[in-house]
Structures are given as structure tokens and as C-alpha cells.
Amino acid sequence: DAHKSEVAHRFKDLGEENFKALVLIAFAQYLQQCPFEDHVKLVNEVTEFAKTCVADESAENCDKSLHTLFGDKLCTVATLRETYGEMADCCAKQEPERNECFLQHKDDNPNLPRLVRPEVDVMCTAFHDNEETFLKKYLYEIARRHPYFYAPELLFFAKRYKAAFTECCQAADKAACLLPKLDELRDEGKASSAKQRLKCASLQKFGERAFKAWAVARLSQRFPKAEFAEVSKLVTDLTKVHTECCHGDLLECADDRADLAKYICENQDSISSKLKECCEKPLLEKSHCIAEVENDEMPADLPSLAADFVESKDVCKNYAEAKDVFLGMFLYEYARRHPDYSVVLLLRLAKTYETTLEKCCAAADPHECYAKVFDEFKPLVEEPQNLIKQNCELFEQLGEYKFQNALLVRYTKKVPQVSTPTLVEVSRNLGKVGSKCCKHPEAKRMPCAEDYLSVVLNQLCVLHEKTPVSDRVTKCCTESLVNRRPCFSALEVDETYVPKEFNAETFTFHADICTLSEKERQIKKQTALVELVKHKPKATKEQLKAVMDDFAAFVEKCCKADDKETCFAEEGKKLVAASQAALGL
């Protein structure tokens, strides 16, 4: 449905508040270094222009595309060359190349200061003084640090952020009310950002077909009673939504996501019995709720898959007639029967089935050739099952912190060239799989664990892509989206790695460690552990454990000392010497 003015269309559909919020998110995700005030000014200018187009769609420039309007606005920033360097060259290009250029310059790890949370009273005063600016600042700070954050979902986070302050700034104990809510929003926000980053990577690096396959599998697990036609329609619409958001088309994305939620709720009888509560909520909550809804129960009496996909005489005929549709049907039928499998496992099975049909449908006796295809699935299913069983046992034995340390050592030995902060961040997140998934019963462990690991390993892939240092990481990240985790799991110690030179400064600690939160202290110790492995990749678990135990005792001792700084200086030297001796450095 062509509109005379796209900007007027979206303004009317979304309303002024959402329009302004989404434009701010879009601008902050593109120009991540620009000050807040500059972005607010640009957003206000765009909003005023949109209002003139609503009043008269034939007014000057109202017929321009959103990319043209937004790109022109971004290119008016005076300090573009000084702040962003070669990104300024994007402005010499025409649409659609200009937008593609901006997208390529999005930075997953921007050089921005860590967000420090002010005192509760300070935050509440700021909230009461100017609620609108306070909430815009939240959108801005999250969007610029997470340039692929799912924009309509960020509006939902902002709504919860506002609700937390509205409630807690009136409470008797503001901090007790507010801080847990902010912690929860922060943790959920990081998880949401990482999940969306994988969707965008899937679309951008592996194409629409890869994303659609993921969506068929996931939606078939979630809506096993829905017909294939219904799932296909939802997949098409969902792909459009995520393509738009990942492409920076945030107004279209939010608008289409609202339409999709409306459609799902109007057709819930033929989609899922679990949607009733979600569909009674307001728009932002409704969309979020649908995205997180539990799997519906499987239909009764589903027949064996073999009847359609192995025993039928028409397998090759059906495959030849419409390959992707037939493979989509296979994926749909397999996934709706297996909520206990991870999506990536289902995609591996579909790939194996496709490869088998490609080979067998060209053979003299196709049926004889593909008759045992389901037997090939067994090892593919058992591999993640065994891996999860082993790692959950290890997690239960060690607890989260020590489990993270085991993973830190494992991954540093696999890819020691990767930067220490990245190894720490990724290994800590990998380690969280234990508390997140091991508590689940067998039937829920694999989808929880392996699909979560896909999200975390994608963080490694996008961070590594910015500054590639390891051919092994590049290979695992680029060869196959669904085999990333098995690829990393299969990596052994990198024998080609030349150990890092010993630098005493890396292992010098000061009294400031004593005032850090438990989490920050853990990160300091884990950073030291990674550096230790980089210096001595052949160190045994026992050697590393001994050194880390000594280190923990050293920190505890000096933090209790009267003259902390002297203790850290003197005892630190002794610890370094003892560690060098223990590890033969």
C-alpha cells in the first residue's frame, strides 16, 4: 500500500511519542558517539517536519523515503569527520548505498564509558525534574551501546523503566524497591540485545533463507497445533519485521511488529491455546509476551515422520517440485514433535536430510539410498545431549564462578589470540548456561542450553569480526551458523600459539580491588587467569588452581590489612615469584 508520504504514514500509525522514541533509537544506533543533546535536536527537527507532512502529504520533501530523510539529517552533523572518521564518507553516497554504509559502521563494542548508576535519590530527583528527558536519556544510552537492540522491544524496556521509577521514587525505602528492578532490567536488556544480535547476524551474514529456517523451527516448536500454512505466514511476517529492524528501518519494523501481534491475537484459535493472556495486554506488553510465550501442547496422535519423509514413494518427486517448501515441511513436522531439541539441532537434522536427498534423488535407487537417513540423525542428537550432561555435572560440582573459570581456561587454550576482555566476557556468559539451564528437566535442557550458547558464541563472533586475530575463530564463525557451537567444542589446544611474554605489571594489584563489588572482583581474578593461561598455555588444571587459590588468599589477606597498599605491593611481589616458580615461567 503506497503512501504519498512515508514519514506521515508512520507518524500517524505509531503516534508522536513512539515516533520520537524510535527516531532517537535509530539515530543513536547509527551515530553512537554523538552527545545526547545533539540527537534530541535532530529528533525534534525530524518530528516537526513529520508533522508538516501529516498536515499536507504533498508538502515539499514529504514524498522522500525515510532513509533519505534520516540520512540527510545525520549528514548535517558538523563533527562527523572528526568523530567518526571514514564513516563521514557515507554521506557522499546516494541511497540505498548510504544507508548500507551507515549500517556497516555500526560498532558492537563502542569506546564508551561504562554506565555508572548514580545514587537513588539523585536518580529520583532527575526523574521528577524532567521525566521526558530522563527516559529519552535511557533510550539513548542503551541504543548507542547496543546498536542492534530490537527497537520496539526497547520501547517496552523504557516503559518498565518508567514504571519502576514512578513506583519506587514514592516508596519508603527507595533503594530496596528500585535497585532490584534496575538490576533485572539490566540483565534482561543484555540478554535481549544478544538474542537480537544473533537474529541480525543470521540475516546479514547467512541470508534470509537461514533466518526463515530458524523461524520455522522455533515457531513450529512454539505453535505445534498451527498448520504449516499458518506457520509459513508467521515466518514470512516475522522475517520482514526483523529484516527491517536489523536494517535500521525502525519505524517500519515497529509498525509491522504491531500488525503481526494484532494478526496473531485475531487468529489465536488456529495458532496456540497459550496466547489468551498475552492478547489481553496493551501493545508493547502484548508483543513481548507473544515473543516469550510457552510452547503449546503437541497435537494428539501425530503420525510417524518416516511415513512422509522416508517411506513415501513420492519423496524425490515432492523434493524436486519445490525443494525449500518440502524441506520447510520436514522442519515444521520435526520441530513440532520435538520441543526437547534445540533449534540449531533441528536445523542440523534438516541440513542432513537435504544433503541426503540431493545425493539420493540422483541415484539409481533413491529409496534404497535414503531409507536409513533417520539413522544418521542419532549421533547428531546424542552429541549435544552428552555435552550438556557432562557440563551440567561439572557446573553442579563447581558452582557458577569456578565453572566459568573452567570455561575461561578451556577457551583461552582453544583461541589464545583473542583479547583478554573478550575471553572474560564470553566465558563468563558461557558459564551462565549452568544456572540458566541445568536446573531444567531433561526435556527442556537442550533447547535452553544450546540455543543460549548460540547467542553467546555470536557475541564472540561479532566482537572478533571487528578485530580479527584468530583464523580458527573466523572459521567457526563463518562456515556454518548452526555448527558454530560444535565447531568451537571440537577445537583443541592451539599448538601453534607462541606464549605471551611475562609482564609483572599484568599481575600487579592495588587496594582499589577491595572496594569493588563481588562481580567486579571476580572479573579482575578471571582476567588474571586468562593472562596466566596466555603465558603458560600448557599449565595443568592443578597448577592453575593452586595459583588462583593463592591469589584469592592474597587478595583476602591484603584487603583485611591495615596498610592495604603496602600489603599489595610486598605480598604481590612474593605471589608473582611463587607463581612463576609453580608454573615454570
Partner: nanobody
Framework: EVQLQESGGGLVEPGGSLRLSCVAS????????MSWVRQAPGKGLEWVSS????????SYADSVKGRFTMSRDNAKNTLYLQLNSLKSEDTAMYYC???????????LGQGTLVTVSS
């Protein structure tokens, strides 16, 4: 507009056979599992059988298992139900419907009447 046109019903003696057909239009036939349901005089709707999207997988109500066979021809957008060893209790209006084991009301065609009587 979704349309389902059933045919093939008639009067048959106990132990006899019939073949029902259902021609579908207005939707992508091969993207839907399909079912047959029936309604005996003065009774509610009863599920008879279902077939998967590709057509290899089928499921039958206990009352018709071993006597009825369901199939489909996706190229012709047509659904079939072969009725063998018919009994008087099979007398009903037979409808084809979209979906596997339909447990929610769905739009029905005109139906085709099967009468088993000596």
C-alpha cells in the same frame, strides 16, 4: 475464499464400499493437514481421520480403523476417503475440513451424505 466441495456419497448396503472426494480451492492445499469429520442424524460432529501435509502420515478414529483409508493428491488439490466394510452406524453427513484432529469449529463444506442400509 476457502471452499471445500465434497462428493461421492450415496446409499450402500452394509459391507459395501464408497469413495468420497473433496476438492479444495481458495488456499494452498498442500500447506494444510486435512481431516474428515462426520455428523450422524441427531448427533454432534465426530472426527473420522486426518492426513499430514505431505500425505504419508494418517490417523484414524478407533471406530473406523482398518476399514477406512484416507489419501490426498496435492497436484489435484483433492482429498479422498475410501470407505470399506460399511456398517449402519457409519450413516452420516461427511465433511472434509482443514487441519489435523480439528478440535475447534472450522468452516464446513456442503458435505456428502452416506447412508448404509439394507
Amino acid at each position: 475464499e476457502v471452499q471445500l466441495q465434497e462428493s461421492g456419497g450415496g446409499l450402500v448396503e452394509p459391507g459395501g464400499s464408497l469413495r468420497l472426494s473433496c476438492v479444495a480451492s481458495g488456499f494452498t492445499f498442500q500447506h494444510y493437514a486435512m481431516s474428515w469429520v462426520r455428523q450422524a442424524p441427531g448427533k454432534g460432529l465426530e472426527w473420522v481421520s486426518s492426513i499430514s501435509i505431505v500425505g504419508g502420515g494418517t490417523s484414524y478414529a478407533d471406530s473406523v480403523k482398518g476399514r477406512f483409508t484416507m489419501s490426498r493428491d496435492n497436484a489435484k488439490n483433492t482429498l479422498y476417503l475410501q470407505l470399506n466394510s460399511l456398517k449402519s452406524e457409519d450413516t452420516a453427513m461427511y465433511y472434509c475440513v482443514r487441519g489435523w484432529h480439528p478440535d475447534v469449529p472450522r468452516p464446513l463444506g456442503q458435505g456428502t451424505l452416506v447412508t448404509v442400509s439394507s
